[in-house]
Amino acid sequence: LIIGFGISGRHSITVTTVASAGNIGEDGILSCTFEPDIKLSDIVIQWLKEGVLGLVHEFKEGKDELSEQDEMFRGRTAVFADQVIVGNASLRLKNVQLTDAGTYKCYIITSKGKGNANLEYKTGAFSMPEVNVDYNASSETLRCEAPRWFPQPTVVWASQVDQGANFSEVSNTSFELNSENVTMKVVSVLYNVTINNTYSCMIENDIAKATGDIKVTESEIKRRSHLQLLNSKAS
């Protein structure tokens, strides 16, 4: 969490951003909140990016003002206009690209004063893994697949019964470049699995951590997966 204050002494307002990650090829959100004002017409929101000459987005007098917008963001940005009055200056970014990563500044002016806060925006690819029993294999084998990751993640297997066990000797992980030549498909195979046990396939890079669980019993197979972004630090 980054909390910024205005520089002009008592005429300063608190602006808060949260470092976040964008999944390339999806819409992303850059979070920013501020002390609200009573009048929408008195609020100015400016989003800037380090190293970019034009503005990322500007919202003033209750509407978008895009005349100074940088070409790389044209047609891609929006604030949540109906939420500005309650102090939400978050930015929606359409079709996140790797090149959108960087340091952004959320700069706010209201009748109470000015304030700003920086935000580190990371971009990459992350997806939910799916773990299945590989019936084609000669021995009891599990196959963990996740369609899109970038940068290249690490894959670690764990089991409920053998907690702390190292499965690197009985697993094999491969990374297959997807057609757009950036993201990769992750496939990890775990051999010699035992029945009545829960196995977890954990995929992690510096942006996200995802886990796929599978419980295999003689009568059924239960699956569960979840994904968590790692760098949500507020500023």
Epitope: L66, G75, A81, D82, K94, S179
Partner: antibody
Framework: QVQLVESGGVLVKPGGSLRLSCAAS????????MSWIRQAPGMGLEWVSY????????YYTDSVKGRFTISRDSAKNSLYLQMNSLRAEDTAVYYC?????????WGQGTLVTVSS | EIVLTQSPGTLSLFPGERATLSCRAS???????LAWYQQKPGQSPRLLIY???SRATGIPDRFSGSGSGTDFTLTISRLEPEDFAVYYC??????????FGQGTKLEIK
């Protein structure tokens, strides 16, 4: 140059199925949001379905949810629309369109007629 | 659900005149996500304006877009014979994800 070519539109009976294809050239499909948009005879444009660049996010307009499925094959650089349980009101020219900043490229359209 | 209402439904003008087409949204739309299209009979739509006011590649400068929030305008400063067509506005990002206006038919008087 950028080109989108739809195919697969025919006359089909109510309740029937159809698969539309859209072959893209001059750009990589998976770099862009892609949509299917339709236009009933003499009517306006209606957005039908969307797939994100990543392929992870898919949306449909309410009237086709549960009946239509959008997909793509990155290796073939093609977009598809599987249409099941077709109704008379699905009769339209179906366009695939690339969303760069707005729908900057459209196919020529393929006519789907649902009639008994 | 966001609704885009275009007016007038039909606009009859002479070549050389100025055309002003309106698109009103039922709730606020980001200027970044508002586009205008032209469609001629038997043809696919063509992108004219994106981000409310930016001309698409190859579009003559007699076409201009303006507006923000809920009110957007497409202006054709001096009508050419090839400009008579149907015009649609379109938004992205609300529910449903994409919405088109019902269209304005621009016809020769």
């Amino acid at each position: 140059q950028v080109q989108l070519v739809e195919s697969g539109g025919v006359l089909v009976k109510p309740g029937g199925s159809l698969r539309l294809s859209c072959a893209a050239s001059g750009f990589t499909l998976s770099d862009y949001y892609m949509s299917w948009i339709r236009q009933a005879p003499g009517m306006g444009l209606e957005w039908v379905s969307y797939i994100s660049s990543s392929g992870s996010t898919i949306y449909y307009t309410d009237s086709v949810k549960g009946r239509f499925t959008i997909s793509r094959d990155s290796a073939k650089n093609s977009l598809y629309l599987q249409m099941n349980s077709l109704r008379a009101e699905d009769t339209a020219v179906y366009y695939c369109a690339r969303d760069g900043v707005g729908f900057d490229y459209w196919g020529q359209g393929t006519l789907v007629t649902v009639s008994s | 659900e966001i609704v885009l209402t275009q007016s007038p439904g039909t606009l009859s003008l002479f070549p050389g005149e100025r055309a002003t087409l309106s698109c009103r949204a039922s709730q606020s739309v980001s200027s970044s996500y508002l586009a205008w299209y032209q469609q001629k009979p038997g043809q696919s739509p063509r992108l004219l304006i994106y981000a409310a006011s930016s001309r698409a590649t190859g579009i003559p400068d007699r076409f201009s877009g303006s507006g923000s929030g809920t009110d957007f305008t497409l202006t054709i400063s001096r009508l050419e014979p090839e400009d008579f067509a149907v015009y649609y506005c379109q938004q992205y990002g609300s529910s449903p994800l994409y919405t088109f206006g019902q269209g304005t038919k621009l016809e020769i008087k």
